[in-house]
């Protein structure tokens, strides 16, 4: 178990022409926040695939308002680290996506509005417990500078954070061949990650029980130097097994770090600090190239012309970004008018229009009542793109032009007779029934069940429906 930590140093205009417009303005102040998405391995995955290693969201940054006429500066950032906890072993190789989001703080109806400003992606090799790795990524005219590292949560340690101590199974002693995990008194050592006897200076492992050799070393425990021409330059005592000269006692003797990396001794091995553009245990891996498959979404990778640009991705239609990781957001141009909802279907744009609007871009205003009148005192009601009249009593139809027959629907129950009246309708109830619609039976003793007859009306009298 452990935590991947991301520290954003700056987000602002990149070098070169075409500085971006500030995302915030006096009319529309905003603040930034960041999202990181991690995926294991260097697999070819679309930007939309799940963040299998985890994801994290930063706090909101300080509110920023652009100064009129000033170019977009580096924008104020949120405090703190983005932390992505991982429960299992750290995979060593991973893909990342870092998104910069803008939160607009103007007078928004229904709360703040969020929009994606930039998205960068990359693939890296990283050992847990190592130093902060620095990186710069560009997305359009924006540049993001950040550092990241993976660290283990004690008592897990190592380049993969493989847990090495576990609770005792018995209260008094550890199992056969295992020692107490001092100073964790109540825990016992788990078997060492690498194969027993694997050279700490010339071997390493990524899976429990294996022993993989660094360049120049061989044998099951990486203790046998490879016989090459470099053996001719004396650097230490001769090895009888190969006739080769074994390096001296210091792990940095002869500098095992390639490509100008500097070597420092660690408690049991060595560590290379690599120059920009190189990484790996011995700085043997150059910056990401086409061989690493850095282009998402079917982008075509072409080798870059300068060291700072090891590759260039030529993106297919509908995608952009240095790694083709960003779907071209044609909706960001807000093509749907009158508050229509924009849907980018990839092959086409669709606008879902609000009620009262129509057209490919919701440009047609279906103002129901404009220039229309409802007859006979009816009132026009807007809604749903179909004009509707609320008619006065006694009238109906689309424009209230039709005289309504209130008795057409046979409103009088239990055989009551209906009479049209200037103010509505009147029901003459059959014997034994009463009520405005003749809906209540009259009890034989003359008491009504529900409700009492109004004063001045006897059961059987016509009941006017008001």
């Amino acid at each position: 178990a452990g935590v991947f930590e991301l520290q954003i140093h700056s987000f602002g205009p990149g070098p070169g022409p075409g500085a971006p417009r500030s995302p915030c303005s006096a009319r529309l102040p905003c603040r930034l926040f960041f999202r990181v998405c991690l995926k294991p391995g260097l697999s070819e995955e679309a930007a939309e695939s799940p963040c299998a290693l985890g994801a994290a969201l930063s706090a909101r940054g300080p509110v920023y308002t652009e100064q009129p006429g000033a170019p977009a500066p580096d924008l104020p950032l949120p405090d703190g680290l983005l932390q992505v906890p991982f429960r299992d072993a750290w995979p060593g190789t991973f893909s990342f996506i870092i998104e910069t989001w803008r939160e607009e703080l103007g007078d928004q109806i229904g709360g703040p509005a969020w929009s994606l400003l930039a998205r960068v992606a990359g693939r890296r090799r990283l050992a847990a417990g190592g130093p902060w790795a620095r990186d710069i990524q560009r997305a359009g005219a924006w540049e993001l500078r950040f550092s990241y590292r993976a660290r283990c949560e004690p008592p897990a340690v190592g380049t993969a954070c493989t847990r090495l101590c576990r609770p005792r199974s018995a209260p008094s002693r550890c199992g056969p061949g295992l020692r107490p995990c001092a100073p964790l008194e109540d825990e016992c050592e788990a078997p060492l990650v690498c194969r027993a006897g694997c050279s700490p200076e010339h071997g390493f492992c990524e899976q429990p029980g294996e022993c993989r050799c660094l360049e120049g070393w061989t044998g099951p425990l990486c203790t046998v130097p490879v016989s090459t021409s470099s053996c001719l330059s004396p650097r230490g005592p001769s090895s009888a097994t190969t006739g080769c000269l074994v390096p001296g006692p210091g792990p940095c003797d002869g500098n095992p770090c390639a490509n100008g990396g500097s070597c420092s001794e660690t408690p049991r091995s060595f560590e290379c600090t690599c120059p920009r553009g190189f990484y790996g245990l011995r700085c043997e891996v150059s910056g990401v190239t086409c061989a690493d498959g850095p282009c998402f979404n079917g982008g075509l990778c072409v080798g870059g012309a300068d060291p700072d640009s090891a590759y260039i991705c030529h993106c297919p239609p509908g995608f952009q970004g240095s790694n083709c990781e960003k779907r071209v957001d044609r909706c960001s141009l807000q093509p749907c008018r009158n508050g229509g909802l924009c849907l980018d279907l990839g092959h086409a744009l669709r606008c879902r229009c609000r009620a009262g609007f129509a057209g490919p871009r919701c440009e047609h205003d279906l103002d129901d009542c404009a220039g229309r009148a409802c007859a006979n005192g009816g009132t026009c009601v807007e809604g749903g793109g179909a004009h509707r009249c609320s008619c006065a009593l006694g009238f109906g139809g689309r424009d209230c032009r039709e005289r309504a027959d209130p008795c057409a629907a046979r409103p009088c129950a239990h055989g009551g007779r209906c009479y049209a009246h200037f103010s509505g309708l009147v029901c003459a109830c059959a014997p034994g029934y009463m009520g405005a619609r003749c809906e209540f039976p009259v009890h034989p003793d003359g008491a009504s069940a529900l409700p009492a007859a109004p004063p001045g009306l006897r059961p059987g009298d016509p009941q006017r429906y008001l």
């Epitope: 008592p155 090495l164 050592e189 049991r268």
Partner: antibody, heavy 124, light 106 residues
Framework: QITLKESGPTLVKPTQTLTLTCTFS??????????VGWIRQPPGKALEWLAH???????RYSPSLKSRLTITKDTSKNQVVLTMTNMDPVDTATYYC????????????????WGQGTLVTVSS | DIQMTQSPSSLSASVGDRVTITCSAH?????MYWYQQKPGKAPKLLIY???NLASGVPSRFSGSGSGTDFTLTISSLQPEDFATYYC?????????FGQGTKLEIK
Amino acid sequence: QITLKESGPTLVKPTQTLTLTCTFSGFSLSTSGMGVGWIRQPPGKALEWLAHIWWDDVKRYSPSLKSRLTITKDTSKNQVVLTMTNMDPVDTATYYCARIVSFDNDVVSAMDYWGQGTLVTVSS
Amino acid sequence: DIQMTQSPSSLSASVGDRVTITCSAHSSVSYMYWYQQKPGKAPKLLIYLTSNLASGVPSRFSGSGSGTDFTLTISSLQPEDFATYYCQQWRSNPFTFGQGTKLEIK
């Protein structure tokens, strides 16, 4: 119960070689993950790491003293020996040995048990 | 060399006080280790792997931090806590200690 004890001369002349022995009990240097280190402390000053040795004979020396230091172990006797050549009055210090534990190929878990220390004075 | 700078160098406090000692590494280290030393005695391990309490150390001691900045905190000082405290890194040879922080009774 884990104990460590330093032994060696208390007074050394300049240019002489100092040999210090650390005798320990309660753990073994044949057990993987175990190491023994030497640390010194001049009077009234901070601690300074000198050297350490691991169960598999991997050794580390302070770069500033590397040419003068040698560390060896005798697993059967539960002893670690540090020799320091060409002693100088500035080497006057209390010398400690301590157990070091590593449960990973390259991460120290702790330097958890220390000897009581032995004061070595370098003077003519 | 990774230099370790402790602050403050000395500190006066009273029993019951909350005390914080910081250790700043001049370059990033994976873990920090803290020791307590009393006059005439050997150092004693307090905290290992940044935040783990060594065996027998009271829970009022705690460690935290990452990268270059680490902290040792004593939540409520006890009379036996007045001593000198050292931090140490095991990242890169030489495996350096801080210059020490002397904690005295006010």
